[in-house]
């Protein structure tokens, strides 16, 4: 199956690659903007420059290009522990990450928010954090792993998920009959 | 098992207000981050909010910032949602899901989820 192509794919295609075709005449192709800049104004004609302006401190355009405007920097999302790890430039947009011994969490495929890395206290490390996750613990006997922490077994009740986890310490813990609330 | 039942969906005017609550059953509700999903008539699953489990830390997506409010009862097992201010593209079935952090994004364990539907 063909792909079906925007009007703008259609104009492109049909002009060699690093040009366009001119909005108003077809048979004319004018040279792409270098990332970094971009078109102020279309090439008068065939074998003439096309007209390309510096993006401004705040914008940038990260490849070749025939747009009207640059496209905004983003800013990183200090709420949700983000910092910037380098600057936006004419031709590359801000890089936002996350600080030392933390990992990201995407909540969308373009917003994340940065956690601690998990520690495993009473536990050793099975897989160290990485950007994109937490650590993996293996907990010591006596100690359950909930939510990627190392639990003492006296904090776990009958019927709860980490039963299986705690055997046979479970016998020896009291409250066994609750509702699994803690 | 792990259960979650929601409720409180229905038909609201676009400004109206709804609260919507997840019941939760077969897990240690506090230990979790939990929140609320949705997805609107043919498109994508997506994270409106999420709370801890304390309660202290939450996330909400740009679009419903400062019109949806996140909460639990971790006494009751219970998740809820204030939903005020609604607009036409709020209407999905949302669904209560748990969080699991790390990557994603993904949605976890999910509830079978209750209609929202906005018009006038």
């Known amino acids: 199956l063909v792909p079906h192509l925007g009007d703008r794919e259609k104009r492109d295609s049909v002009c060699p690659q690093g040009k366009y075709i001119h909005p108003q005449n077809n048979s004319i192709c004018c040279t792409k903007c270098h990332k970094g800049t971009y078109l102020y104004n279309d090439c008068p004609g065939p074998g003439q420059d096309t007209d390309c302006r510096e993006c401004e401190s705040g914008s940038f355009t990260a490849s070749e290009n025939h747009l009207r405007h640059c496209l905004s920097c983003s800013k990183c999302r200090k709420e949700m522990g983000q910092v910037e790890i380098s600057s936006c430039t004419v031709d590359r947009d801000t890089v936002c990450g996350c600080r030392k011994n933390q990992y990201r969490h995407y909540w969308s495929e373009n917003l994340f928010q940065c956690f601690n890395c998990s520690l495993c206290l009473n536990g050793t490390v099975h897989l160290s954090c990485q950007e994109k996750q937490n650590t993996v613990c293996t907990c010591h006997a006596g100690f359950f792993l909930r939510e990627n922490e190392c639990v003492s077994c006296s904090n776990c009740k009958k019927s709860l998920e980490c039963t299986k986890l705690c055997l046979p310490q479970i016998e020896n813990v009291k409250g066994t009959e609750d509702s699994g609330t803690t | 098992e792990v259960q979650l039942l929601e409720s409180g969906g229905g038909l609201v005017q676009p400004g109206g207000s709804l609260r919507l609550s997840c019941a939760v059953s077969?897990?240690?509700?506090?230990?979790?981050?939990m929140g609320w999903v949705r997805q609107a008539p043919g498109k994508g699953l997506e994270w409106v909010s999420a709370?801890?489990?304390?309660?202290?830390?939450?996330y909400y997506a740009d679009s419903v910032k400062g019109r949806f409010t996140i909460s639990r009862d971790n006494s009751k097992n219970t998740l809820y949602l204030q939903m005020n201010s609604l607009r036409a593209e709020d209407a999905a079935v949302y669904y209560c899901?748990?969080?699991?952090?790390?990557?994603?994004?993904?949605?976890?364990?999910r509830g079978q989820g209750t209609l929202v539907t906005v018009s006038s």
């Open positions: 709370i801890s489990g304390s309660g202290g830390s939450t």
């Open positions: 077969g897990l240690t509700f506090e230990w979790y981050w």
């Open positions: 899901a748990k969080v699991k952090l790390g990557g994603g994004p993904n949605f976890g364990y």
